[in-house]
Structures are given as C-alpha cells and as structure tokens.
C-alpha cells in the first residue's frame, strides 16, 4: 500500500458520516485537472471510506488522488486535515 493511499484513507476515516456524504457531493463537481474524468455518481454515493479511497486511487492515481482529496477537504473548511494529508503524502 502506498503512503498517499494510506493518507487518503486516514483522512476519509476521520470524517463524520455527514462530512463523508458532503465530501462525495463536492467530489462530483470539484474542478479537475485537464485529462481527468469524474467518478460516476451512482458508484460514488454508496461507498464507505475504504471503497472511496480505492476508487480515488484507481481513478486518479495516488499523487493526484491525494491532491484532489485535499482540495475537497479545503472546500469543506477542513484545511487542517487537508494539510495533514498533504504532509503525510510528501514525507
């Protein structure tokens, strides 16, 4: 398991159920870097933190998956968690 994947999982597992739901909704409309597609809505909404981590990494690979996760956390006002995720990724 990669360091970035672990960091993404750790962040998502620290969200409340309500925050995880909000994370998924924001992920559906977050601005994406050129060349990346969006995870289909139907697949996304039923996922738990572990499934969502796997989907983020398979869709976006570890580096961009971690960056994207951090940005969605920032959009949710969770800047500290986003910073911790990025720090763990860059260790």
């Amino acid at each position: 398991m990669g360091r970035a994947r672990d960091a993404i999982l750790d962040a998502l597992e620290n969200l409340t159920a309500e925050e995880l739901k909000k994370f998924k909704l924001k992920l559906l409309s977050v601005p994406l870097a050129a060349g990346y597609g969006r995870i289909p809505r139907g697949a996304l909404l039923s996922m738990d933190a572990l499934d969502l981590t796997d989907k983020l990494v398979s869709f976006y690979l570890e580096t961009y998956g971690a960056e994207l996760t951090a940005n969605v956390l920032r959009d949710m006002g969770l800047q500290e968690m986003a910073g911790q995720l990025q720090a763990a990724t860059h260790q």
Epitope: S29, N71, R74, D75, G77, Q79, E80
Partner: antibody
Framework: QVQLQQPGTELVKPGASVKLSCRAS?????????????LEWIGNINLSNGRTNYN??FRAMATLTVDKSSSTAYTQLSSLTSEDSAVYYC?????????????WGQGTSVTVSS | NIVMTQYPKSMSLSIGERVTLRCKAS??????VSWYQQKPEQSPKLLIY???NRYTGVPDRFTGSGSATDFILTITSVQAEDLADYHC?????????FGAGTKLELK
C-alpha cells in the same frame, strides 16, 4: 440573497467582555477590521456540527459558539482593550468550492472605552 | 501563517482606465484566493473566488487570474462605482489571511 443579521453597535469598558451574535448557516467566520485597516480572520465555526478553527492570535480572547436551534453563531470577546475597538463582521462560506466568504453581515461596531 | 501582500497600496485613476491589482502569497496557495470589494462604511463583498471565478452578479469587467503565489485582479474599464478598497484573501490554510488592501481613488 442571504442576509446575515448582526446588531449594530456595542459599547464596553476595558477589561470587560462582549458577546456578538450572527444569524447564519454553514461555516460562519468572524473577521475584525480596525478603522482604516485591513481584515483579520478571528476564526470560524460550523453551525451543523460545532467544529471550530481559531487564529492563534485571537484564541485567548475569542470563544466561538453556536445555538443550532436559532441558527445563531456567537463570538465572546473577553478582557477587551482599546486595541479591540473595531468592526466585527460575520461571514458565511456557501459557495461549493474554494471556501470564499460570500455572504457578509453588516458588522457590529465595538467601542472599548471607560 | 501565509502572508498575502497586496500592491500597490493605492491607485489614482480616471474613469474608463484599465486597472491591475496584484496580490502575492508567501507560499503556494493553489487557486484558493478570493478578491473582495469594500466601499466606505460597508461590508466587504465577494467579487472573485478560486482565483478566477466571477461571483454571481459581478460585472464582467472584473477578471481574476493567477495561481500558486501570484494573483491579479483586472478591472477592464473602471466605473465610478468601482472606487473602493480591494482585499485579497487565501483559504488554502488556517489561519485564513487577507492582504492589507488596495484603495482605488479618483485622479
């Protein structure tokens, strides 16, 4: 257009406390502006779960709380000095991405004077 | 803390002029920069968020650009109602921070 409701003015004595209120929703920020100066972020509170973040500069003097039943955010400012005379704004972050402050209250002018 | 430096501090200009306001972050803040307009005795109002997204109802003469550490607010043809203070702010990291502001005045 969402309107954030704040009382207009507060006059308090040095060393005293004041509790400012703001009818709001979502993430509510508190921002200080001294006359003729820039904006300083005090902290924010999430009205749905009570999660708070503070600017360390204000942590000792500001306490952010929420009353969910009335959708009201509060900041209690304690041990006030003349340096705390300022307009205090509440602002919301409602835009889905990038967390800007898109709705602002009209501000409460706090004057600290004996 | 991330320091946001705005320049110039003030500008005197004529109606119809093109204006460029600059904001520099002390470290990379991605696109997490907003621009606010504040008129005397009024609350700030959001103009631009995410460095380049115009907020609802903001005239298209206001344009934001930049990323990472260097950001620009351009007003293509200044109107009398644009004379105000302009603040940039970052929402990338806590504490959220603002620049000291740029004041636009009539020449």
């Amino acid at each position: 257009q969402v309107q954030l409701q704040q009382p207009g003015t507060e006059l308090v004595k040095p060393g005293a406390s004041v509790k400012l209120s703001c009818r709001a929703s979502g993430w509510t920020h508190w921002v200080k502006q001294r006359p003729g100066q820039g904006l300083e972020w005090i902290g924010n509170i999430n009205l749905s779960n009570g999660r708070t973040n503070y600017n360390e500069k204000f942590r000792a003097m500001a306490t952010l709380t929420v009353d969910k039943s009335s959708s009201t955010a509060y900041t209690q400012l304690s041990s006030l000095t003349s340096e705390d005379s300022a307009v205090y704004y509440c602002a919301n972050s409602m835009v889905p991405h990038f967390f800007p402050m898109d709705y602002w209250g009209q501000g409460t002018s706090v004057t600290v004077s004996s | 803390n991330i320091v946001m430096t705005q320049y110039p501090k003030s500008m005197s200009l004529s109606i119809g002029e093109r204006v460029t306001l600059r904001c520099k972050a002390s470290e990379n803040v991605g696109s997490y920069v907003s621009w606010y307009q504040q008129k005397p005795e009024q609350s700030p109002k959001l103009l631009i968020y995410g460095a380049s997204n115009r907020y609802t109802g903001v005239p298209d003469r206001f344009t934001g650009s930049g990323s990472a550490t260097d950001f620009i607010l351009t007003i293509t043809s200044v109107q009398a109602e644009d004379l105000a203070d302009y603040h940039c702010g970052q929402s990338y990291n806590y504490p959220l921070t603002f620049g000291a502001g740029t004041k636009l005045e009539l020449k």
